[in-house]
């Protein structure tokens, strides 16, 4: 079957899933495809309970999430509902910027220095979390 | 030990199909993400395709998107590329390897000795 | 696609010399960089990853350092046994990318 009793080597379990918290940054479609890569997802944040473990694993450094409104409305990777989920935006944020000069607005969610989040250019090379079910993940452990 | 021995290279014409197979041992191959690269006196080595563990996730160089697809049999412990509407440019020596162990990146830690396909009228 | 610029292309050594290749990355690929040997009609063979991390049974007379951009691969002392072609690879982000290599020649 495909359930496993623990999480892959290098990950944290955490209330019946998996953690992986990198230790450099990338561009938030980079951070998306390594996930993939890992049979996961950039995380997904769907309590404040889980809110506060991600920030006090990450600690205050911006770290991408799997939330984006490339194509429109806000949408969570895995298809969780983003209008009836849990948030925890900044004051006025998201504000979806074009200030910054970079092109285009502010596309992408991340975690802010205190936890808090802030849409941001997707480009940006922040690190990333990427989360998988417990019961989703393989018999084996991956290596990275 | 641990080992790759890729098979299934050979001449064929353009437009034409071959499949290449890349045999794993030594290992726990279904813990492990999974490369195919390829190497041409013109044009050094060029990667192909990576492959997560599951055979769920899968990326493509632009160069063969649409025409390769990587594929796993984990209960075979084997690895897959099958090649489709073949040119004379895909003309080289094709490897498999498997993804190692750095932590956040994608890098290769063990090679195969490569299979030769050679796409000729 | 980051870019990988590899030099020099070849280098002719005699046994005990030091040898260091270069390798220059198009943008910032962090520590994600392998080097690699590749002798001929042999499997390429991985020396060192993570930019400096020396590979499980790698001589130690084979180095690695460098950063972001910037990277540096050494042996310290040629030997015959280390005539074959290295090449830097970036693993930072697909696609991957490789150096054109270097071929190492004794004298």
């Known amino acids: 079957g495909s359930e496993r009793a623990c999480c892959p080597v290098n990950w944290v379990e955490h209330e019946r899933s998996c953690y992986w918290f990198s230790r450099s940054g990338k561009a938030w479609a980079d951070a998306d495809n390594y996930c993939r890569l890992e049979d996961a997802h950039l995380v997904v944040v769907t309590s404040w309970e889980e809110q506060k473990f991600v920030q006090h694993h990450i600690g205050p450094v911006n770290t991408w999430m799997g939330l984006h409104d490339q194509n429109g409305p806000w949408k969570w990777v895995d298809g969780t509902d983003y209008e009836t989920g849990f948030k925890n935006w900044r004051p006025e944020q998201p504000d979806d910027w074009y200030g910054h000069g970079l092109g285009g607005g502010e596309d992408c969610a991340h975690f802010t220095d205190d936890g808090r989040w802030n849409d941001d250019v997707c480009q940006r090379p922040y690190r990333w979390v990427c989360e998988t079910e417990l019961d989703k993940a393989s018999q084996e452990p991956p290596l990275l | 030990q641990v080992q790759l021995v890729e098979s299934g290279g050979g001449v064929v014409q353009p437009g034409r199909s071959l499949r290449l197979s890349c045999a794993a041992s030594g290992f726990t191959f279904s813990s492990y993400g999974m490369h195919w690269v390829r190497q041409t006196p013109g044009k050094g080595l060029e990667w192909v395709a990576i492959?997560?563990?599951?055979?769920?996730?899968?990326y493509y160089a632009d160069s063969v998107k649409g025409r390769f697809t990587i594929s796993r049999d984990n209960s075979k412990n084997t690895l897959y590329l099958q090649m489709n509407s073949l040119r004379a440019e895909d003309t080289a020596v094709y490897y498999c390897?498997?993804?190692?162990?750095?932590?956040?990146?994608?890098?290769?830690?063990?090679w195969g000795q490569g299979t030769t396909v050679t796409v000729s009228s | 696609d980051i870019q990988m610029t590899q030099s020099p292309s070849s280098r002719s050594a005699s046994v005990g010399d030091r040898v260091t290749i270069t390798c220059q990355a198009s943008?910032?690929?962090?520590?994600?960089l392998n080097w690699c040997q590749q002798k001929p009609g042999k499997a390429l063979k991985l020396l060192i990853y993570?930019?400096?991390t020396l590979e499980t049974g790698v001589p130690s007379r084979f180095s690695g350092s460098g950063s972001g951009t910037d990277f540096t691969f050494t042996i310290s002392s040629v030997q015959p046994e280390d005539i074959a072609t290295y090449y830097c690879?970036?693993?930072?982000?697909?696609?991957?990318?490789f150096g054109q290599g270097t071929r190492l020649e004794i004298k």
């Open positions: 993570d930019a400096s």
């Open positions: 690879q970036q693993y930072d982000n697909v696609p991957i990318t």
């Open positions: 943008q910032d690929i962090s520590n994600y």
């Open positions: 492959i997560s563990y599951v055979g769920k996730n899968k």
């Open positions: 390897a498997r993804r190692g162990n750095s932590y956040g990146g994608y890098g290769m830690d063990v």
